[in-house]
């Protein structure tokens, strides 16, 4: 028995089209994705085979303009009109909290939401229950598949859940639910899902009957043969994982953005044991026809954000690389960019001993989600903005201890190369990392701009020292594993929201051309 | 065609222990999973265990955990139950099921257990 | 007693529309989903609706199933008099993990 499994995951809000790097389509001879080209391709492959699901394995939530509008709406909207037959949460989904996930996704999503390690308690567990499903069998061609979903047990650290769901580790919550499965006469069982590639792996190795794993939350581009645009694969699709009783378990994913529709074609034998599997991510580029009446859809939805979004606030003469494979690697202009409209938006309380009462940003790359193109006359909106600052998040002021500052950075790149987001971009700083050294003791050099002179130049971090920091909100609450900072800081005052920080910056100065300038070093 | 044929029911004295059989025949027995099912004389269907197609793992209903243990032998295509420490509330007609979805689901005859002094 | 429960009979005449319910709870049909079976007198057990909604091949459009939260229900409409059967609803309770069955309900038809 053959089955097609379509998937997609991070999509991050991409509704329309967009440039090859994911940010706003500037050329649309050359532009990607978006939910009506997706449609399209959908809609072909179901004609053509007999079999086919159509899941996304989370991050729907948070990327561009249209999540700051709609909040969700878009989302439940689309991907019903897309006849998704599955989701699992993924961590942004709770970005709003879970009053913006029940609302606008939950109630009105027309498909089954997974995740069989989130727990409710409290009032919330009735409200939820019949919303969040942990598993759902769905039957095509007189046949059954259940799809147990899983989300990452981190969301609590990457998002704002709340404190009445806990998320449990994922192997520990999946294998009940699959041995309940099979129990119930389910013996083709797929792991759907968003907690990383290691994690994917990991559930295909240690959960005992399942059969496939479709992923998401690390954005992994696999591929057999030659890629087709500019993402290199972290391996073959799919891949294949050697389970503990000795199964091969196609583990796969879509990289992100709605740029590819992840295609896999998996034949079951009689007792629901997979006997082959193959495909490939299939990318979305403009030979494949956006549908039109999706399309006109999207344009009907479209005038609420034109009027919200479209004035220009000032010209970049420069490409601003707020691109995942910079940002959370090396230093990158994008980053020196806001770092210093977060240091320019606090400038005050000067006097003849201070230049200001605050010189140092620093701002986790993970949280750049998007670069913007100078090729489009220059021009930077409200818009742009808010594909590069999705989350609505505000830049606070802490004070920390020049002890605490030096965790953070050992924490920048205790896991350096995985492309996770808590890499650091800097402003008023200067860093110097060996990773040829062990994680806890990368940091070389770690100089800081002073502030107490007249003259701003950089000095050796001290230990025993307390500076003010400007940083998102998200680190200052321990987002991406800074606990450090959470845990340490010794003043905390909320700040303004980060795109207006950011777009008053750039109205001010009218053009910008953030360089990369040796902020961030390694020896 | 799919058949499944219980065995080894009969009269037995309280405390007693009883072993059931079940033979498949007309389909691949170990792609699924299997439950026994009982009915009291002119009551309802009450579960009563249920094996994995692995047979890794097993469920058992509280009123007979740890009395009763189901197993399987996928090379004879049999289900087994094995009932000790019998009681009068254990008499039923026990039938062999594929409980599941869809064409999945198939219930043998049953195979009636008396447990009486 | 079981977890699910139903009416322990049901009646109807020829060509009326009967409706049969089974009420459970969140760890059993809140979270799982619901078959339907008829059992004739002195037969086995035989699947008519599954994944909460589903018809198995063969069996007549007049037998429809439903779930809303923690209920499930099975309506037969258009009566025949071979309809008359004692019918159960089933699903896997995950507070006790394993399948539960309705007490049944008798249909008699007038």
């Known amino acids: 028995w053959e089955l097609t499994i379509l998937h997609t995951n991070d999509v991050h809000s991409r509704l329309e089209q967009t440039s090859e790097d994911s940010s706003k389509c500037v050329n649309a001879s050359r532009c990607m994705g978006g939910v009506a080209r997706l449609f399209t391709k959908v809609q072909q492959i179901r004609r053509a085979e007999p079999n086919v699901l159509l899941l996304d394995a989370g991050d729907q939530y948070q990327g561009t303009i249209w999540f700051t509008v709609y909040k969700g709406a878009e989302v439940a909207h689309f991907m019903n009109a897309l006849r998704y037959d599955a989701m699992a949460l993924g961590n942004h989904e709770f970005d709003n909290g879970v009053e913006g996930l029940i609302e606008p996704l939950l109630k009105e999503a027309k498909f089954p939401i997974l995740s069989a390690n989130i727990k409710a308690k409290g009032p919330l567990a009735s409200q939820i229950s019949g919303l969040v499903h942990p598993y759902k069998i769905l039957h095509i061609d007189s046949e059954v598949v259940g799809i147990v979903g899983y989300t990452s047990k981190e969301t609590p650290f990457l998002s704002n859940p709340g404190t009445n769901l806990v998320f449990e580790d994922e192997i520990t919550a999946l294998q009940p639910e699959v041995d309940k499965l099979t129990a119930m006469g389910v013996n083709k069982i797929i792991a759907l899902g968003h907690s990383g590639f290691e994690m994917d792996k990991l559930i295909a190795q240690k959960v005992r009957g399942v059969d496939v794993v479709v992923g998401g939350h690390s954005n992994t581009f696999l591929y057999t043969g030659n890629p087709p645009s500019k993402e290199v694969p972290a391996g073959k699709y799919p891949f294949i994982v050697t389970s503990d009783d000795g199964r091969k378990v196609p583990v796969v994913q879509a990289y992100a953005f709605g740029k590819y529709l992840g295609y896999l074609k998996i034949e079951f034998d009689e007792r629901g044991n997979v006997i082959s599997s193959h495909g490939n991510p299939i990318l979305l580029n403009s030979s494949i026809p956006e549908d039109p009446s999706i399309k006109a859809d999207i344009n009907k939805w479209r005038i609420k954000l034109d009027n919200y979004s479209t004035q220009e606030l000032g010209k970049t003469i420069v490409y601003l690389d707020g691109s995942s494979q910079s940002c959370r690697f090396r230093e990158c202009n994008m980053g020196n960019l806001i770092c210093d409209a977060m240091i320019n938006n606090n400038l005050r309380h000067a006097d003849e001993m201070f230049w200001n009462h605050v010189s140092m940003c620093i701002l986790n790359g993970g949280g750049i989600r998007s670069p913007i193109d100078e090729r489009n006359n220059g021009t930077i909106t409200w818009e742009n903005l808010a594909a590069v600052l999705p989350f609505g998040g505000t830049f606070d002021l802490v004070q920390l201890k020049g002890s605490t500052l030096k965790k953070a950075f050992e924490h920048s790149v205790h896991r350096y190369g995985q492309s996770t987001g808590e890499f650091l971009q800097v402003g008023g700083i200067h860093v110097v990392y060996d990773l040829s050294r062990k994680p806890g003791d990368r940091v070389v050099k770690l100089d800081v701009l002073c502030t107490k002179c007249r003259v701003p130049s950089y000095d050796p971090l001290k230990m025993d020292e307390v500076y003010k920091v400007i940083l998102p909100n998200f680190l200052a609450n321990g987002g991406d594993g800074f606990q450090m900072i959470k845990d340490e800081l010794l003043r905390h005052d909320s700040g303004d929201q980060d795109i207006n920080v950011v777009s008053t910056y750039i109205s001010k100065m009218k053009v910008i051309y953030p360089a990369v300038e040796g902020r961030i070093k390694f020896s | 065609e799919v058949q499944l044929l219980e065995s080894g029911g009969g009269l037995v004295q309280p405390g007693g222990s009883l072993r059931l059989s079940c033979a498949a025949s007309g389909f691949t027995f170990s792609s699924y999973a299997y439950s026994w099912v009982r009915q009291a004389p002119g009551k309802g269907l009450e579960w009563v265990s249920a094996i994995s197609g692995s047979g890794g793992r097993t469920y058992y209903a509280d009123s007979v955990k740890g009395r009763f243990t189901i197993s399987r032998d996928n090379s004879k295509n049999t289900l087994y139950l094995q009932m000790n420490s019998l009681r009068a509330e254990d008499t039923a007609v026990y039938y062999c099921?594929?409980?599941?979805?869809?064409?999945?689901?198939?219930w043998g005859r049953g195979t009636l257990v008396t447990v009486s002094s | 007693q079981s977890v699910l429960t139903q009416p322990p009979s049901a009646s109807g005449t020829p060509g009326q529309r009967v409706t049969i319910s089974c009420s459970g709870s969140?760890?059993?049909?809140?979270?799982?989903?619901v078959n339907w079976y008829q059992q004739l007198p002195g037969t086995a057990p035989k699947l008519l609706i599954y994944l909460d909604n589903l018809r198995l091949s063969g069996v007549p459009d007049r037998f429809s199933g439903s779930k809303s939260g923690t209920s499930a229900s099975l309506a037969i409409s258009g009566l025949q008099s071979e309809d008359e059967a004692d019918y159960y609803c089933a699903t896997w309770d995950d507070s006790h993990p394993g399948w539960t069955f309705g007490g049944g309900t008798k249909l008699t038809v007038l």
């Open positions: 969140l760890s059993n049909i809140g979270r799982n989903p």
């Open positions: 099921a594929r409980l599941g979805y869809g064409r999945v689901d198939e």
